[in-house]
């Protein structure tokens, strides 16, 4: 008995598509072995039509695909544009066609609907609109026009030209009589329901000379599109419902049990708490299409999603809908990185952002998720030297450590910095990740003076006190600019006296600026790092003024001014307030991801994110 299982019989019609799911025991060998779909020949062989190794027969070119879902122990064969020639006996299987790990499937494709014994067949998707055309002869031009639905043995009046509308169709049906030149009336039914399916009869006149026309209305539930994304990655649902619902509220919901579809997000401002900080509903186009981006995918995000349009902002009968089945691949190429980073007021955080290693040259971005309305993510910094004006001097995006990870450092933290931030690039949109910054009680570990004023032509020494916990770390000073923080020479001045209960391992490291010039004005950071992995930083603003009295300046902690809450920026700074991640196409077209993605090489920060995936500050 073969362990492979699937549908024994599949029936469809010409022009339609089928999705055949084959189940296999999800052992590690089975998960990675070749999957195939082959057609059985009269003489017993089985000719491969498509396989998981990329082979597609010319018979299936452009109309079939095979997708493996290793966690579920299934693979799915999609075949579109069916013809009667596709009818036959097939096998879905694992390994080599002739080895017996397979299941027999019979596919029967029947003739597509057209005119069945003078019955016009209308095939329309759920929630959409159908127009049933009813011709009549001149002698019935002035007579009553009507549409009936066959319910069991009896025709039930749906609508007529005298103004009657069946209660089941109220508000979504109309009868149009064409101009005098055309001997035709039409019935338009909107927001089609599954219950609308059936046999209809349109009639002009009521006597024996009446004109009659049969119609068969078939209402289809939308075929869900299979979407397969990596754990911790991102998914984008593109929803195109048509211009007729352009001004109707839109929603994305997730089917929970049975018919319930819980709203994930809608244009009326509703958002499910589980998606806080990791979802954006992108503004819709004029044609009513919109997209929803979800980042930081979790195992529990897997399921069936519907997007639709309805004034209530949720699924109702007659909502036009689109459907997806999201599978979340736990064998993810996206490395683990902390989902929560903690910092203290006045302190700093260093956030590690993963990106696709194959796209090292891509532009990196960091944005702040805002929940207002449908959510947006205005950019704060990019790897091309742009920093949002309000973040000057306290935010830097570094390409280090590289090889699939970049670093974002934010210091001078306040409670206003708490929130959700997204790491992304202009390359692979599936690699958008989310991190939450939490501001907790505590004191910054690094101690520096507040504002410092240097005198032109003199020497300035700025101290930075490192507690003993950083004894094994590299300590540095650097000068901040839009493109990063350029390292500067510094002097180790021995143990610091700034810490109580801290032994000889504490350190005072000073920055010395000799013969200060105007160019020395700006933000300076002191910080710690281990190799290419950055830890805490502290920032000092150095102002430069004309000489008042001779001598050098040695700044102590006690004499320093408090750092200003907000700095006035010079007008020359390039400020792009409007740069926001809303439409993912702002940066790159969504790319189809090749099946053979690089496995992450496990390189990541030496921070142990632990089972909670939380990182306290940036200290290790």
């Amino acid at each position: 008995k073969s362990p492979i299982f699937g549908p024994e019989e599949v029936n469809s019609v010409e022009g339609n598509s089928v999705s055949i799911t084959c189940y296999y025991p999800p052992t590690s060998v089975n998960r990675h072995t070749r999957k195939y779909w082959c057609r059985q020949g009269a003489r017993g062989g089985c000719i491969t039509l498509i396989s998981s190794e990329g082979y597609v027969s010319s018979k299936y070119a452009g109309r079939a695909n095979l997708t493996n879902f290793p966690e579920n122990g299934t693979f799915v064969v999609n075949i579109a544009q069916l013809s009667q020639d596709d009818s036959g006996r097939y096998k879905c299987g694992l390994g080599i066609n002739s080895r017996g790990l397979s299941f027999d499937v019979s596919l029967e494709v029947s003739q597509g609907p057209g005119l069945l014994n003078d019955t016009k067949v209308y095939t329309v998707d759920l929630g959409r609109t159908v127009t049933i055309n009813c011709p009549f002869k001149t002698e019935n031009a002035q007579k009553r026009k009507s549409l009936y639905k066959q319910i069991g043995l009896y025709p039930v009046l749906v609508i007529d030209s005298s103004g009657y509308v069946n209660p089941n169709y109220t508000g979504r049906i109309r009868l149009d009589i064409q101009g005098t030149g055309q001997l035709l009336f039409s019935v338009v039914i909107n927001q089609l329901r599954l219950s609308d399916a059936g046999q209809y009869l349109c009639q002009a006149g009521d006597d024996s000379n009446s004109n009659k026309k049969n119609a068969d209305l078939q209402v289809l539930k939308p075929e869900p599109e299979l979407v397969y994304e990596d754990l911790r990655g991102s998914v984008t649902f593109h929803c195109a419902l048509g211009p007729e619902v352009a001004n109707v509220a839109k929603f994305l919901c997730r089917q929970s049990s049975g018919e319930n579809c819980d709203v994930v997000v809608n244009t009326l401002g509703k958002r499910a708490p589980a998606f806080e900080g990791r979802i954006l509903l992108n503004p819709q186009d004029k044609d009513g299409s919109f997209s929803v981006v979800i980042t930081g995918l979790r195992k529990e995000d897997a399921g069936r999603y519907l997007c639709g349009a309805h004034s209530d902002g949720q699924l109702q009968e007659g909502s036009p809908i689109q459907a997806w089945q999201l599978f979340v691949n736990e064998e993810s190429t996206i490395p683990r990185s902390p989902t929560v980073v903690k910092g203290v007021a006045g302190g700093s955080v260093a956030v590690l952002c993963p990106y696709n290693r194959k796209e090292s040259k891509s532009i990196k971005y960091w944005c702040l998720w805002e929940g207002a309305q449908n959510g947006r993510c205005p950019l704060l910094v990019d790897s091309e030297g742009w920093v949002k004006a309000q973040y000057e001097g306290r935010l830097s995006l570094l390409e280090e450590p590289g090889n699939g990870t970049f670093t974002v450092i934010l210091n001078q933290l306040t409670s206003r910095d708490a929130g959700f931030y997204w790491c992304l690039t202009n390359g692979d949109t599936l690699w958008r990740t989310t991190v939450e910054i939490k501001i907790i009680e505590g004191e910054p570990n690094l101690k520096v003076p507040g504002n410092v004023t240097a005198v032109l032509g003199e020497t300035l020494k700025v101290p930075c006190h490192f507690p003993c916990k950083f004894s094994s770390y590299e300590k540095y000073w650097c000068k901040w600019n839009n493109t990063g923080c350029q390292a500067l020479p510094s002097q180790d001045e021995g143990p610091s006296k700034a810490f109580v209960n801290c032994d000889e391992n504490s350190r005072l490291v000073s920055l010395t600026l000799n013969l200060v010039t105007r160019a020395d004005e700006g933000w300076y950071w002191c910080g710690v790092k281990q190799g290419h992995f950055y830890g805490e930083t502290a920032a000092v603003y150095v102002a430069v003024e004309e000489r008042k009295a001779a001598g050098s300046r040695d700044v102590s902690l006690a004499k320093a001014d408090a750092a200003p809450d907000e700095k006035v920026l010079d007008s020359g700074f390039r400020e792009i307030e409007n740069k926001a991640i809303q439409d993912p196409r702002l940066f790159a077209e969504e790319k189809a991801v090749a099946d053979t993605r690089d496995q992450a090489d496990g390189s990541r920060a030496s921070v142990d994110s632990g089972s909670s995936e939380e990182q306290g500050g940036s200290s290790r």
């Epitope: 299982f5 549908p7 024994e8 019989e9 599949v10 029936n11 469809s12 019609v13 339609n16 598509s17 089928v18 999705s19 055949i20 189940y23 299934t74 095939t123 599954l194 219950s195 078939q218 289809l220 539930k221 075929e223 869900p224 089917q255 049990s257 049975g258 018919e259 069936r304 009968e317 089945q325």
Partner: nanobody, 127 residues
Framework: EVQLVESGGGVVQAEDSLRLSCAAS????????MGWFRQAPGKEREFVAT??????????YYDDSVKGRFAVSGDNTKNTMNLQMKGLNLEDTGVYYC??????????????????WGQGTQVTVSS
């Protein structure tokens, strides 16, 4: 409230035929999957057959033990399903349950892939 009602059970001789029916009521949506499970005294509930609808395609699944003898059919616009059973044998005895779900994800052989269940109808095959 959703209800599934099975009918057609009874006592038959070995090698005889029987036709079971299942009707769902209380649903505003068409079902995407309806299946038959059976449970013999003292045994686990086991999969018999399932029919799935997706778009204008129909998919039929059978357990090996009933292949070639049982045929499942149905109409998802009416939310009804039938099971035509031929060549019945003593091992086919048990309570036959109808199960249904509005969508068709998960392995159709597992009870967890169905949300709605009927009360069951008894089929007894005597020698």
């Amino acid at each position: 409230e959703v209800q599934l009602v099975e009918s057609g059970g009874g006592v038959v001789q070995a090698e005889d035929s029987l036709r079971l029916s299942c009707a769902a009521s209380g649903l505003s949506f068409s079902l995407s999957r309806m299946g038959w499970f059976r449970q013999a005294p003292g045994k686990e509930r086991e999969f018999v057959a399932t029919i799935e609808w997706s778009g204008r395609s129909t998919y039929k699944y059978y357990d090996d033990s009933v292949k070639g003898r049982f045929a499942v059919s149905g109409d998802n616009t009416k939310n009804t399903m039938n099971l035509q059973m031929k060549g019945l044998n003593l091992e086919d005895t048990g309570v036959y349950y109808c199960a249904a779900n509005p969508n068709n994800y998960g392995d159709p052989r597992t009870p967890g892939a169905y949300q709605y269940w009927g009360q069951g109808t008894q089929v007894t095959v005597s020698s």
